[in-house]
C-alpha cells in the first residue's frame, strides 16, 4: 500500500507523542534510528500531553491537522513553477508551516507558539492549550534534551520515510 | 485572527465527534443550523468514537491528518490550470480525498472504506480501528439517520464557515 | 563568561527620547532572546520587552507599548531600547537580560544597569 | 495580565533559621515562575527557574515548590551573605515581577 501523505513519518512520531503511547513512540522512533537521548527528549514531550488528558491530545490534533491542510501547507506546493506542478513531483516534504511551528514549539517563547497556532485557529481553547503545552515542555526539558529533539526532527525530515 | 485552514468547520465537527464532547459537538452543530435529527445521527457516530476509546480517536484523528495533508489534497489544488494557482484562489472548500472518505464511511461498505484508508495509511492497527468504526456506525446507523448525516455534511461543505 | 554591559542612560526632558544599548560578550548572541527590565527607585522590578534571537518577534509591556522600541543587531552583538515620549515614570535603573537557550528561562543573566532620568 | 502577589512584603529572620516566601499568580501559570534574588546595589540573579530547579552555581539551601498558582521560595538554613530582596517572576504569558520580598538578618 502505498504511503500517500507528506512526510508519514513525522505523522507517526507526532501522534504518538500526542496519544501518549509510549510502545508507538518506541516503535516509530526505531525507524529513524532515534538515540538515547534523542528518545529522551521525545518522552518528555510526550509527558506533557498525558499529564494534560485527552482535550490537550485532541485540540493539539486539531491544530495539526489545521496546519496540515491550511493553505499555507497547499500553498508551499503551488509556489513552485508550473513544470514542478505535476502530481507526481509533489513532494513528500513536510510543510515549512509545520515545520516553523515544530520549531517554535521547541524554541520559541510561549507567546510566539500561540501567535502563530493562533494564524491557524482561533478558538480560545485551542490557544489556551497550545499555550499550557508549550510552558510544561519549556518547563520538562533541558538545553540539551531541545537540542536532541532538534536534531531527532532533522532526522525525520531526512529520512527516507519522510 | 484568519482562519487559513481548509473547511474549519468541517474539522471542528470531526475533531468534536471523534472526541466525544458532546457539548463540543452541540456547539459545532449550531453554527450551521442542524436539525435535531441531524444531531442525533452525529451522536450516533460520535458513540462509536467514545465505546472504542482514546486509541480509536487518536488512530482516526491521524486517518483524517493523514488524507488532509495527503498529495490527493494538495494534488487538487494543482490539477487547475495556472491561472487558478495563485495562493489567494486556494479554495476553502474541503478536499475531495477527504469528502470521498466520509462519503464512504456512511454510504459504503466497511471493505470499500477500509481500501479506501489504506490508500493513505497501511498501518494494520490503522486500518483495523477504521473497520470497527465503520461497523459500528453501520450498526448503529438507520438509513434515515445517515441521509440525516449526509444533509448534514451538505449544510457544512456549503456553509460560510468553510 | 557571560557580560552584559548596559549603556546609554542618563538625564532627559519629558518628552524626550533616548537610546540605550547594551553589549554583550562571552556567549553566541544571535542564540539567544534578550529582554529589558527595568527598576525605579526604591521600588521593585518591571519588564518591559523582549526580542527572539532573530529580532523578527518582539514583545512589550502595556506600561512602554507604542513608546519604546527593542531591536538588536547580532552582527555586533548589541541589543538597543529606543525610548521615546519619555515620562517622569519612566525613570529607573534599566537592564538588559539574557533568556536561557531555546527559552529554558527567562533572565539567566543580567548587566550591571543603566540609569536613565526624566525629569524638568 | 498575570499579576504575581509575593508574601510576605519584609521578613527579619535570624541566621540559621528557616524563610519561606510566597508568590501567587492571578491564574493558573503550570510551573512557568522563577525566583531571583538582588542584593543592595547588585543586580538580580537567577535562583531557581520553572518552580524548582536550581540554577547552576546556587547554594543547596535554597529551594522551589509549587505548580499552578501557588509557589514557594525556601531558604533552609540563612546566611548572612542571603540578605536581599527576592522577586519572582511568571513567563507563562509575557512576563510579570511579584512587588518583591525584603529578608533581613536580625
Known amino acids: 500500500v502505498k504511503m500517500a501523505e507528506t512526510c508519514p513519518i513525522f505523522y507517526d512520531v507526532f501522534f504518538a507523542v500526542a496519544n501518549g503511547n509510549e510502545l508507538l513512540l518506541d516503535l516509530s522512533l526505531t525507524k529513524v534510528n532515534a538515540t538515547e537521548p534523542e528518545r529522551t527528549a521525545m518522552k518528555k514531550i510526550q509527558d506533557c500531553y498525558v499529564e494534560n488528558g485527552l482535550i490537550s491530545r485532541v485540540l493539539d490534533g486539531l491544530v495539526m491537522t489545521t496546519i496540515s491542510s491550511s493553505k499555507d501547507c497547499m500553498g508551499e506546493a503551488v509556489q513552485n513553477t508550473v513544470e514542478d506542478l505535476k502530481l507526481n513531483t509533489l513532494g513528500r516534504e513536510i510543510c515549512p508551516a509545520v515545520k516553523r511551528g515544530v520549531d517554535l514549539f521547541l524554541t520559541g517563547t510561549p507567546d510566539e507558539y500561540v501567535e502563530q497556532v493562533a494564524q491557524y485557529k482561533a478558538l480560545p481553547v485551542v490557544l489556551e492549550n497550545a499555550r499550557i503545552l508549550k510552558n510544561c515542555v519549556d518547563a520538562k526539558m533541558t538545553e540539551e534534551d531541545k537540542e536532541n529533539a532538534l536534531s531527532l526532527l532533522d532526522k525525520i525530515y531526512t529520512s527516507p520515510l519522510c | 485572527v484568519k482562519m487559513a485552514e481548509t473547511c474549519p468547520i468541517f474539522y471542528d465537527v470531526f475533531f468534536a465527534v471523534a472526541n466525544g464532547n458532546e457539548l463540543l459537538l452541540d456547539l459545532s452543530l449550531t453554527k450551521v443550523n442542524a436539525t435535531e435529527p441531524e444531531r442525533t445521527a452525529m451522536k450516533k457516530i460520535q458513540d462509536c468514537y467514545v465505546e472504542n476509546g482514546l486509541i480509536s480517536r487518536v488512530l482516526d484523528g491521524l486517518v483524517m491528518t493523514t488524507i488532509s495533508s495527503s498529495k490527493d489534497c494538495m494534488g487538487e489544488a494543482v490539477q487547475n490550470t495556472v491561472e487558478d494557482l495563485k495562493l489567494n484562489t486556494l479554495g476553502r472548500e474541503i478536499c475531495p480525498a477527504v469528502k470521498r472518505g466520509v462519503d464512504l464511511f456512511l454510504t459504503g461498505t466497511p471493505d470499500e472504506y477500509v481500501e479506501q484508508v489504506a490508500q493513505y495509511k497501511a498501518l494494520p492497527v490503522v486500518l483495523e480501528n477504521a473497520r470497527i468504526l465503520k461497523n459500528c456506525v453501520d450498526a448503529k446507523m438507520t438509513e434515515e439517520d445517515k441521509e440525516n448525516a449526509l444533509s448534514l455534511l451538505d449544510k457544512i461543505y456549503t456553509s460560510p464557515l468553510c | 563568561q557571560v557580560q552584559l554591559v548596559e549603556s546609554g542612560g542618563g538625564l532627559v526632558k519629558p518628552g524626550g527620547s533616548l537610546r540605550l544599548s547594551c553589549a554583550a560578550s562571552g556567549f553566541t548572541f544571535s542564540d539567544y532572546y534578550m529582554n529589558w527590565i527595568r527598576q525605579a527607585p526604591g521600588k521593585g522590578l518591571e519588564w518591559i520587552s523582549y526580542i527572539s534571537s532573530s529580532g523578527s518577534t518582539t514583545y512589550y509591556a502595556d506600561s512602554v507599548k507604542g513608546r519604546f522600541t527593542i531591536s538588536r543587531d547580532n552582527a555586533k552583538n548589541s541589543l538597543f531600547l529606543q525610548m521615546n515620549s519619555l515620562r517622569g515614570e519612566d525613570t529607573a535603573v534599566y537592564y538588559c537580560?539574557?533568556?536561557?537557550?531555546?527559552?529554558?528561562?527567562?533572565?539567566?543573566?543580567w548587566g550591571q544597569g543603566t540609569t536613565v532620568t526624566v525629569s524638568s | 495580565e498575570i499579576v504575581m502577589t509575593q508574601s510576605p512584603d519584609f521578613q527579619s529572620v535570624a541566621p540559621k533559621e528557616k524563610v519561606t516566601i510566597t508568590c501567587r499568580a492571578s491564574?493558573?501559570?503550570?510551573?512557568?515562575l522563577h525566583w531571583y534574588q538582588q542584593k543592595p546595589d547588585q543586580s538580580p540573579k537567577l535562583l531557581i527557574k520553572y518552580a524548582s530547579q536550581s540554577f547552576s552555581g546556587v547554594p543547596s539551601r535554597f529551594s522551589g515548590s509549587g505548580s499552578g498558582t501557588d509557589f514557594t521560595l525556601t531558604i533552609n538554613s540563612l546566611e548572612a551573605e542571603d540578605a536581599a530582596t527576592y522577586y519572582c517572576?511568571?513567563?507563562?504569558?509575557?512576563?510579570?515581577f511579584g512587588q518583591g520580598t525584603k529578608v533581613e538578618i536580625k
Open positions: 537580560a539574557r533568556d536561557g537557550r531555546y527559552n529554558t528561562v527567562a533572565g539567566d543573566y
Open positions: 517572576l511568571q513567563s507563562y504569558t509575557l512576563r510579570t
Open positions: 491564574q493558573n501559570i503550570g510551573g512557568s
